[in-house]
């Protein structure tokens, strides 16, 4: 229904706390370089204005759209051109072009320092002094580094953060209480960020239809007892929510997400038997819980998929007269029978089915032509199953760090032109799939592995888009989203690459490496490994292992030495010589 004042409507629906949080996230995602204080001031102004509209919906400017109100605020920021360059040109445009322009200027890799966590005592002091400001800083810092973070989920993570601090700051040993808990939240939030970015990419590149297909598959897996009409309704609503968040309409997105959670909890009987625990929780926890609820038990009496989609005489009629509905039904029926498949795989199978019908329904004897379609799915299913087996076996053998290194070598060979920091980041993220998925029960591994890898590779594509350097990467990134992972997996050594010259300084280290945290040490070593591969793209695994073992030994020796600096300056050049010889 239409409201006289959109801003008053959203303020009333969301309540002041969530309203302010979402406005802060929106501003931080649009203008990623502004300080917290600058954004906090704007948020307060917007909130005060919203309150005047709540008191009187007919007050001046209360009838303006949220894009107009927020855009005007952003465009009034002093020194916009000095700080943001051509983004300032957006302010010469009218809505809706102005908002589109802001969206296009979101930076997936802003040049901001890593978000450093203060030490426990300091954190607890500032949290106790002003919890609201403390949480505001958290929202601001995460949102500006992750401009597509799913806003209502970010409020959920802030709430988690708040609860952890409340609990741990009352403990004697704050550090050992906070560290593992906050690490857990950080890990989950980072995964949430890449997953949401993938959804926005799907929406931006391929439109709502592509996202809705993703949603139908995912929801059908989770709610196999819901019928197609129910799944379609949920998928349509979920598509709207994600479209709004990806489009920067964060207030509408959070409001609609709350509505969807409410609908699901009021209609559990026709959706799933597993929702009650989620539905007993308060709003943010409820919506989060519903988004990752366990799969309902599959109905026992599902007929074979072939009956409707292969054996029936009316397949071509159904397809011709209502393509989207028929293919949607196929995707629903196949997905509800296969919670053990990844969404990407299910979408590839639906695409294969569609292509088969396109071809066969134009032939003289369609049933003879499409009669083998289900058998033709086999290689498409085997490929990711083999990928999971091979990679999980390797992970179990090497552990997370060793597995990341194996992936780093593989991907540097596939795309040696890509910058080393991007390769290292990608390999570290791809390598985490082992810890995240390989320990799961067999039937959960494939969906976990492939859908996670697809999300990480989406980030690789986004970073590569900014500065395209590898034809291999361009080829895989320009195809459809669901084909990306198989495309990357199929890449081999890039034969067109001219190896990098060996530069001794790339492999020269100093004693400061000894005091770095373990993670930073790993990154330094992985940077060296990527550079080695760029120098010798066809080096064998054995050669690389020899060099890396030597390198690890060198670091261990020198970091234990009484005179570290002397050790690094004398042993370092010897290491470089040995490396060159080992790779010759």
């Amino acid at each position: 229904e239409a409201h006289k004042s959109e801003i008053a409507h959203r303020y009333n629906d969301l309540g002041e706390q969530h309203f302010k949080g979402l406005v802060l996230i929106a501003f931080s995602q649009y203008l990623q370089k502004c300080s917290y204080d600058e954004h906090a001031k704007l948020v307060q102004e917007v909130t005060d204005f919203a309150k005047t509209c709540v008191a009187d919906e007919s007050a001046a400017n209360c009838d303006k759209s949220l894009h107009t109100l927020f855009g005007d605020k952003l465009c009034a920021i002093p020194n916009l051109r000095e700080n943001y360059g051509e983004l300032a040109d957006c302010c010469t445009k009218q809505e809706p072009e102005r908002n589109e322009c802001f969206l296009q200027h979101k930076d997936d890799n802003p040049s901001l320092p890593p978000f450093e966590r203060p030490e426990a005592e300091a954190m607890c002091t500032s949290f106790k002094e002003n919890p609201t400001t403390f949480m505001g800083h958290y929202l601001h810092e995460v949102a500006r580094r992750h401009p597509y973070f799913y806003a209502p989920e970010l409020l959920y993570y802030a709430e988690q953060y708040n609860e952890i601090l409340t609990q741990c700051c009352a403990e004697a040993d704050k550090e050992s209480c906070l560290t593992p808990k906050l690490d857990g939240v950080k890990e989950k939030a980072l995964v949430s960020s890449v997953r949401q970015r993938m959804k926005c990419s799907s929406m931006q590149k391929f439109g709502e239809r592509a996202f809705k297909a993703w949603a139908v598959a995912r929801l059908s897996q989770t709610f196999p007892n819901a019928d197609f009409a129910e799944i379609t309704k949920l998928a349509t609503d979920l598509t709207k929510v994600n479209k709004e968040c990806c489009h920067g309409d964060l207030l509408e997105c959070a409001d609609d997400r709350a509505e969807l959670a409410k609908y699901m909890c009021e209609n559990q009987a026709t959706i799933s038997s597993k929702l009650q625990t989620c539905c007993d929780k308060p709003l943010l926890k409820k919506a989060h819980c519903l988004s990752e609820v366990e799969h309902d038990t599959m109905p026992a009496d599902l007929p074979a998929i072939a009956a409707d989609f292969v054996e029936d005489q009316e397949v071509c009629k159904n397809y011709a007269e209502a393509k989207d509905v028929f293919l949607g039904t196929f995707l629903y029926e196949y997905s509800r029978r296969h919670p053990d498949y990844s969404v990407s795989l299910l979408l590839r199978l639906a695409k294969k089915y569609e292509a088969t019908l396109e071809k066969c329904c134009a032939e003289a004897n369609p049933p003879a032509c499409y009669g083998t379609v289900l058998a033709e799915f086999q290689p498409l299913v085997e490929e990711p199953k083999n990928l999971v087996k091979t990679n999980c076996d390797l992970y179990e053998k090497l552990g997370e760090y060793g597995f990341q290194n194996a992936i780093l070598v593989r991907y540097t060979q596939k795309a040696p032109q890509v910058s080393t920091p991007t390769l290292v980041e990608a390999a570290r993220n791809l390598g985490r799939v082992g810890t995240k998925c390989c320990t799961l029960p067999e039937d959960q591994r494939l969906p976990c592995v492939e859908d996670y890898l697809s999300a990480i590779l989406n980030r690789v594509c986004l970073l590569h888009e900014k500065t395209p350097v590898s034809e291999h990467v361009t080829k895989c990134c320009s195809g459809s989203l669901v084909e990306r992972r198989p495309c990357f997996s199929a890449l081999t050594v890039d034969e067109t690459y001219v190896p990098k010259e060996f530069k001794a300084e790339t492999f020269t280290f100093h004693s400061d490496i000894c005091t770095l945290p373990e993670k930073e040490k790993q990154i330094k070593k992985q940077t060296a490994l990527a550079e080695l591969v760029k120098h010798k793209p066809k080096a064998t695994a054995e050669q690389l292992k020899t060099v890396m073992d030597d390198f690890a030994q060198f670091l261990d020796t020198c970091c234990k030495a009484a005179d570290k600096d002397t050790c690094f300056s004398t042993e370092g050049p010897n290491l470089v010589t040995r490396c060159k010889d080992a790779l010759a």
């Epitope: 197609f228 009409a229 129910e230 007929p303 009956a307 029936d312 009316e314 509905v325």
Partner: nanobody, 126 residues
Framework: EVQLLESGGGLVQPGGSLRLSCAAS????????VAWFRQAPGKGREFVAG????????YYADSVKGRFTISRDNSKNTLYLQMNSLRPEDTAVYYC???????????????????WGQGTLVTVSS
């Protein structure tokens, strides 16, 4: 739970007409694939006509094409079968069946329909 109730059957002379109705409750009729089947004494259930849910695609058995018309009235949540030019071989108990959640009729196989009415008898005889 879906309930279906057929009505409109009776005795009719060859060449005559009848209109069968199937009232549904517990589910909107436009959201689900619905079909008419018939069963003559000593025979299995045979597909007569069907209509898709959400999309008005209609399907007919070859033996009734041009004589029977399937339709529905969403406001009344009712399915109809208009039967013209009736023949003695059309004599049977007529059932309506539904496959909730199937937006299209994708089968003429009775086993794939989980919900049925109790049937209405149609006798074509002079």
């Amino acid at each position: 739970e879906v309930q279906l109730l057929e009505s409109g059957g009776g005795l009719v002379q060859p060449g005559g007409s009848l209109r069968l109705s199937c009232a549904a409750s517990g589910r909107y009729i436009d959201e689900t694939a619905v079909a008419w089947f018939r069963q003559a004494p000593g025979k299995g259930r045979e597909f007569v006509a069907g209509i898709g849910g959400g999309v008005d695609i209609t399907y007919y058995a070859d033996s009734v094409k041009g004589r029977f018309t399937i339709s529905r009235d969403n406001s009344k949540n009712t399915l109809y079968l208009q039967m013209n030019s009736l023949r003695p071989e059309d004599t049977a108990v007529y059932y309506c069946g539904t496959r909730p959640g199937r937006p299209l009729i994708t089968s003429k196989v009775a086993d794939l329909y989980p919900y049925w009415g109790q049937g209405t008898l149609v006798t074509v005889s002079s």
